[in-house]
């Protein structure tokens, strides 16, 4: 699986999850988030050669098409597969609000 | 929606579905497929600027991060959203077999 366990331990050039730390205040301008100050959002990148973690029949077909037609611009792309939520704390007035934001952290990637 | 209705009618540079005809025999080497000879598989391509059909909170965050940090290499990618099946005819011995292959045709795209 192209997940953090594999990708963070290996020097993998092809599609894999990469570490990316985002600081809410500096990187997004979200000054209202009290905790955490930032988090590892991660991202997916790297080429998708034929059959690499192909997501659908279409991505398999496209990968094969690309292999047999190297000049073609139509190739699968490395995108998030499994995402996890992130819990944040912020204030509404004086009331602390704890909220779970869905799909914030990339745990694995796929070729789609 | 970044679907065939919109994308095939507009000269859209950003993420959109593009027409791609695949000939089973010539492009894939699938000589066993009797009918059809080929089909419009289509594919997704084009940049994913900030907020273009963002798929998840992560792609929204990544798009925003990329906008505020233009030198960053972490950006969402244009990939299939809605896919449709394709019915093919092939022979097993002299017996014709009709089969529906799932997720063969891209109908719309998203930034993921």
């Amino acid at each position: 699986a192209l997940d953090t366990n594999y990708c963070f331990r290996n020097l993998e050039e092809n599609c894999c999850v990469r570490p990316l730390y985002i600081d809410f205040r500096q990187d997004l301008g979200w000054k209202w988030v009290h905790e955490p100050k930032g988090y590892y959002a991660n991202f997916c990148s790297g080429p998708c050669p034929y059959l690499r973690s192909a997501d659908t029949t279409h991505s398999t077909v496209l990968g094969l098409y690309n292999t047999l037609n190297p000049e073609a611009s139509a190739s699968p792309c490395c995108v998030p597969q499994d995402l996890e939520p992130l819990t944040i704390l912020y204030y509404v007035g004086r009331t602390p609000k704890v909220e779970q934001l869905s799909n914030m952290v990339v745990k694995s990637c796929k070729c789609s | 929606a970044l679907d065939t209705n919109y994308c095939f009618r507009n000269l859209e540079e950003n993420c959109c579905v593009r027409p791609l005809y695949i000939d089973f025999r010539q492009d894939l080497g699938w000589k066993w497929v009797h009918e059809p000879k080929g089909y419009y598989a289509n594919f997704c391509s084009g940049p994913c600027p900030y907020l273009r059909s963002a798929d998840t909170t992560h792609s929204t965050v990544l798009g925003l991060y990329n906008t505020l940090n233009p030198e960053a290499s972490a950006s969402p990618c244009c990939v299939p959203q809605d896919l449709e099946p394709l019915t093919i005819l092939y022979y097993v011995g002299r017996t014709p077999k009709v089969e529906q292959l799932s997720n063969m045709v891209v109908k719309s795209c998203k930034c993921s």
Epitope: Y90, T95, E99 | T60, G63, L64
Partner: antibody, heavy 119, light 112 residues
Amino acid sequence: QVQLQQPGAELVKPGASVKMSCKASGYIFTSYWITWVKQRPGQGLEWIGDIFPGTGSTNYNEKFKTKASLTVDTSSSTANMQLSSLTSEDSAVYSCARKLGPNYAVDYWGQGTSVTVSS
Amino acid sequence: DVVMTQTPLSLPVSLGDQASISCRSSQSLIHSHGNTYLHWYLQKPGQSPKLLIYKLSNRFSGVPDRFSGSGSGTDFTLKISRVEAEDLGVYFCSQSTHVPFTFGSGTKLEIK
């Protein structure tokens, strides 16, 4: 420049619902909260609630929790507010505005949508 | 709910005069973080409100330095050192320390 565009007026019947829009331009939509305010002549301003386009997070004034529903469409940089079970008490000007966080001051306002509830 | 009481309701002034508007809250507006979330707006006829002062005493960008905000806890004042014709309209105070956020009823600044 920052702009929040709202339709000028809506005429609706009692008991019906109305959905009004607020199209944002000139800034990064997912960096700011959108707040909604009700203004009736001689009654002052009332805070309805806030929504954050970046995550879809919402906060409501308890008074409007069953009356108003806030949503966003990030692809078109548009915030929406739906008001349900309308009565004459809901006749007012509804303005959207933006702010950097729930506790921050509103720095730019829309022109407001005038809602008239009448049979 | 925190009640914001503004006085006077109407303030007739001559151009060039100093004007002072008072706003009193029914509870302290000092947040646990130390900030006082008290803001001032000006609304001209047929227009949407414009931000003048945020967080007690900070002038918003483009606001002339003849406007100043002061106060602490529950008593706040907006001062205009030399009233100009463009300053006429209704002034509102607003608090965002307590939920629900509330507004004053307004003070109409008009020519004597």
